[in-house]
Amino acid sequence: KKEDGESTAPTPRPKILRCKCHHHCPEDSVNNICSTDGYCFTMIEEDDSGMPVVTSGCLGLEGSDFQCRDTPIPHQRRSIECCTERNECNKDLHPTLPPLKNRDFVDGPIHHK
C-alpha cells in the first residue's frame, strides 16, 4: 500500500505557461493573463490605416512552431516573437516592424507625420 502523499512517478504532462495578453485575451483570461501549453508571443503589425498595433498573448503548442516563424507576408508589415523561458516572458519581447520595401512606397498609402 502506498503511503499517503506518495504516488508512482508522474506521467509527463504539459506545464501551464502564463502569458501577458493584450488585444488577444481569450475568454478564460484573468487580469490580462492567459494560460497555454505552448508559447507566449508579442506581435506588431500595421492596421488598415498603417498604424502599428501591438498584440500579445498565448499560442497553443499545436501549430505554434509555424506561427512563431516570422515568415514575410507580401504587402503586410508584421513581426512576431515567441518565448517559453518563464511566465509572462512576452512582457520583455519588443518586435519591430520590418522596414518598408521600395515597392511599398509606390503601392502603399502615404502616411503624413
Epitope: R13, I16, P26, D28, G60, N87
Partner: antibody, heavy 117, light 113 residues
Framework: QVQLQQPGAELVKPGASVKLSCKAS????????MHWVKQRPGQGLEWIGD????????NYNQKFKGKATLTVDTTSSTAYMQLSSLTSEDSAVYYC??????????WGQGTTLTVSS | DIVMTQSPSSLAMSVGQKVTMSCKSS????????????LAWYQQKPGQSPKLLVY???TRESGVPDRFIGSGSGTDFTLTISSVQAEDLADYFC?????????FGAGTKLELK
C-alpha cells in the same frame, strides 16, 4: 515515486506567523506548479495559490493575499507557505499539491495547523 | 470567481448500486479553443488527502478503476460510480481548472447502507 512530505502538525499562538513546508521528491521539482489548499472541517477545500518553482512566479487567491506568502527552495526541492497574523480562522489542514494544468495530480498528506493560546 | 455547486451533499448506497453525483458551475468550463471542459473530480477517504479521479471532465486518471466515469459539458457535470464498492466510501469533490482562482464544490459524502 512522487512524494510530497509535510509535517503532521503545527501549534501556533494567535497573532504569530508560521512557515509550513512541503518537501518534494521523485520528480523534477521545476516541472510542476506547486499549489497550497486549505481544508477546514465541514468547509470543503479552498485554493490558496500556486508557485512555479522554475521562475518563482506566483498566483494567489485574492482572499489569501496578505495572509499567505509562497516561496520555494529549488536546491532542496522544498516549497514553503508562510501564514501571518494567525487567528482561529486559520486553524485547518493545509495541503501542498502539484499540477501541470491546474488540476492536482499529487497531494501531500497535509499539515494540521492549530492556532491556540 | 467561478462557483461550484455539488449535489446531493450526501447519499447512502448499497454495494453494487449505481451512484451519480452532480456538479454545476456558475459559468461554462468549456474552452472554445480546444473544446475541452476544465473540470476535475477528487476522492477523499477519511483521514487521507484527496486523490485525483478525473480531469478534463471525462479523462480518467491512470490507475483509477473504470467504474468511475466523468461526464458532462459546459456547466453541468456528473460523476458516476457504475457499481459502488465498500472502499468507495469517501467524500467526492469537483474542481474547476478553467481559470484562477481555482475553486471546488462543497463535496458529496458517499455513505454505505
Amino acid at each position: 515515486q512522487v512524494q510530497l512530505q509535510q509535517p503532521g502538525a503545527e501549534l501556533v499562538k494567535p497573532g504569530a506567523s508560521v512557515k509550513l513546508s512541503c518537501k518534494a521528491s521523485g520528480y523534477t521539482f521545476t516541472s510542476y506548479w506547486m499549489h497550497w489548499v486549505k481544508q477546514r472541517p465541514g468547509q470543503g477545500l479552498e485554493w490558496i495559490g500556486d508557485i512555479d518553482p522554475s521562475d518563482r512566479y506566483t498566483n494567489y487567491n485574492q482572499k489569501f493575499k496578505g495572509k499567505a506568502t509562497l516561496t520555494v527552495d529549488t536546491t532542496s526541492s522544498t516549497a514553503y507557505m508562510q501564514l501571518s497574523s494567525l487567528t482561529s480562522e486559520d486553524s485547518a489542514v493545509y495541503y501542498c499539491a502539484i499540477s501541470g494544468w491546474d488540476y492536482f495530480d499529487y497531494w501531500g498528506q497535509g499539515t494540521t495547523l492549530t492556532v491556540s493560546s | 470567481d467561478i462557483v461550484m455547486t455539488q449535489s446531493p451533499s450526501s447519499l447512502a448506497m448499497s454495494v453494487g448500486q449505481k451512484v451519480t453525483m452532480s456538479c454545476k458551475s456558475s459559468q461554462s468550463l468549456l474552452k472554445s479553443s480546444n473544446q475541452k471542459n476544465y473540470l476535475a473530480w477528487y476522492q477523499q477517504k477519511p483521514g487521507q488527502s484527496p486523490k485525483l479521479l478525473v480531469y478534463f471532465a471525462s479523462t480518467r486518471e491512470s490507475g483509477v478503476p473504470d467504474r468511475f466515469i466523468g461526464s458532462g459539458s459546459g456547466t453541468d457535470f456528473t460523476l458516476t460510480i457504475s457499481s459502488v464498492q465498500a472502499e468507495d466510501l469517501a467524500d467526492y469533490f469537483c474542481q474547476q481548472h478553467y481559470n484562477i482562482p481555482l475553486t471546488f464544490g462543497a463535496g458529496t459524502k458517499l455513505e454505505l447502507k
